[in-house]
């Protein structure tokens, strides 16, 4: 049960952490104009990885897509790309998780496979987070290295009568939504390898073996003390394992294989 | 069409107060920035304040800051500008306007209300 | 706050000759994220309401004859109009629409010679 259930949350967490870095690498508000040296702008500035906007006091807003692709920074280009394999990453772990999800039946799918599954989109989801955050981490380094500059131009060469405003551009919306949700397809892939690990069967499964002792006629066989030597009725351990079927209960109760020496 | 029509305007002593009042018609008012524009007599035009669509935002010229207020009612499609510790300098045609128009420009303007501050 | 100087006050031009009016700002109305101007131009007749000519310190308002132009950027901005009418006889108008408070220039008297 609680397998399903860290599954599960898993699951919801990565496809909200995922939507997230959609909605992130979507949006335009990447960087936002720094109101500190005009606060009483009439004209507002914003950028996102795909186009810029300017928003006027009348209301209107006015945006213009990059149409260039060689004339783009390297860091712009290599934030779009981290942002995109996140999101292919993601879409794919999603895809993936769908059908490792124990609640799902799909054929006589075994519990095996669903954690191999169950694994690979936790992976995914750990690597599209890791890229998201990276890439929002870029931009935002970019962000910081470009502001002191810019504040650095502010300061020097203003000897002349006529004053000229250097548009300093700060952390967008954006930014807190990538991060936030980076965080959330990480922490949704580590609950999916979590969970993994109670998927899977932790014991190679044997045969029924007979290991003829010298002295005694007694017939060991994997699954529990059942025989004449007097251990007697161990009723968790009932169960003869002939490597066959089990059920969806008795997942976690069989001995692991280093019972067996 | 698009219609601006002050009111309130006349004859007050100094220090006393004043309320203009402007009706919109003609566009989706509560979408739209509002300006108070003034021009004394012979003189040239002189911006008084503005206030954003949602009323988040409120500007006024130095001249009138801590006098003059503005303030709006979409859903009485009005704009007002209340006008308190008025001096004969105040003396003017008061006009309301929109930006209506890109580039943050004052496309539609009203007729005017005259507002005299005299003893 | 941002300062226009307009210059000449009042110009005296021929009918079908050109008339230039400049306005200087005290503060660069340029905005790098849309490569604009934030200069406006109005006109306003005798015992009328200003009326809008030209927005983006170039672009001009639709309905406005051609005639009108604008130009100029950063701080230098200039109003042309290039074969005066009597009906261009009036008051001319920048105004800063970049920061508050929207200051406008002082007004250039336009009359025919």
């Known amino acids: 049960m609680a397998v399903t259930a860290c599954q599960g949350l898993g699951f919801v967490v990565s496809l909200i952490g995922i939507a997230g870095i959609i909605a992130a690498t979507c949006m335009d508000q990447w960087s936002t104009q720094d109101l500190y040296n005009n606060p009483v702008t009439a004209v507002f500035n914003y950028q996102g990885l795909w186009r810029s906007c300017v928003r006027e006091s009348s209301g209107f807003t006015e945006c213009r897509g990059y149409f260039t692709l060689l004339g783009l920074p390297a860091m712009l280009q290599a934030v779009r790309a981290l942002m995109i394999v996140g999101i292919v990453l993601g879409a794919i772990g999603l895809l993936v998780s769908i059908f490792a999800l124990k609640c799902i039946r799909i054929g006589s799918m075994e519990d095996s496979a669903k954690a191999n599954m169950t694994l690979t989109s936790g992976i995914m989801f750990i690597v599209s987070g890791l890229c998201a955050i990276a890439g929002v981490s870029v931009f935002a380094n970019m962000l910081v290295t470009n502001f002191w500059m810019s504040t650095a131009n502010m300061y020097t060469g203003m000897g002349g009568m006529v004053q000229t405003v250097q548009t300093r551009y700060t952390f967008g919306a954006a930014l807190f939504v990538g991060w936030v949700a980076g965080g959330l397809t990480l922490i949704g892939g580590v609950m999916m390898c979590i969970a993994c690990r109670g998927l899977a069967p932790e014991e190679t499964n044997y045969k029924a073996v007979s290991y003829h002792a010298s002295g005694h006629s007694v017939a060991y066989k994997p699954g529990g003390f059942k025989a004449s030597t007097g251990f007697g009725s161990n009723t968790k351990n009932k169960k003869i394992y002939d490597g066959g079927a089990r059920t969806e209960d008795e997942v976690q109760s069989y001995p692991s294989k280093h019972d067996y020496v | 069409e698009v219609q601006l029509v002050e009111s309130g305007g006349g004859l007050v002593q100094p220090g006393g107060s004043l309320r203009l009042s402007c009706a919109a018609s003609g566009f989706t008012f509560s979408s739209f920035g509002m300006h108070w524009v003034r021009q004394a007599p012979g003189k040239g035009l002189e911006w008084v304040s503005y206030i954003s669509s949602g009323s988040g935002s409120i500007y006024y010229a130095d001249t009138v800051k801590g006098r003059f207020t503005i303030s709006r009612d979409n859903a009485k499609n009005s704009l007002y500008l209340q006008m308190n510790s008025l001096r004969a300098e105040d003396t003017a045609v008061y006009y309301c306007?929109?930006?209506?128009?890109?580039?943050?420009?004052?496309?539609?303007w009203g007729q005017g209300t005259t507002v005299t501050v005299s003893s | 706050d941002v300062v226009l100087t307009q210059s000449p006050d009042s110009l005296a031009v021929s009918l079908g000759e050109r008339a230039t009016i400049n306005c200087k700002s005290s503060?660069?109305?340029?905005?790098?994220?849309?490569?604009?101007?934030?200069l406006t131009w109005y006109q306003q007749k005798p015992g009328q309401t200003p009326k809008l000519l030209i927005y983006w310190a170039s672009t001009r308002k639709s309905g406005v004859p051609d005639r009108f132009s604008g130009s100029g950027s950063g701080t230098d901005f200039t109003l042309t109009i290039s074969s005066l009418q009597a009906e261009d006889v009036a008051v001319y108008y920048c105004q800063n629409v970049y920061s508050y408070p929207l200051t406008f220039g002082g007004g250039t008297k336009v009359e025919i010679k």
């Open positions: 306007a929109t930006s209506y128009y890109y580039g943050n420009a004052l496309e539609y």
């Open positions: 503060q660069s109305l340029f905005n790098v994220g849309n490569q604009k101007n934030y």
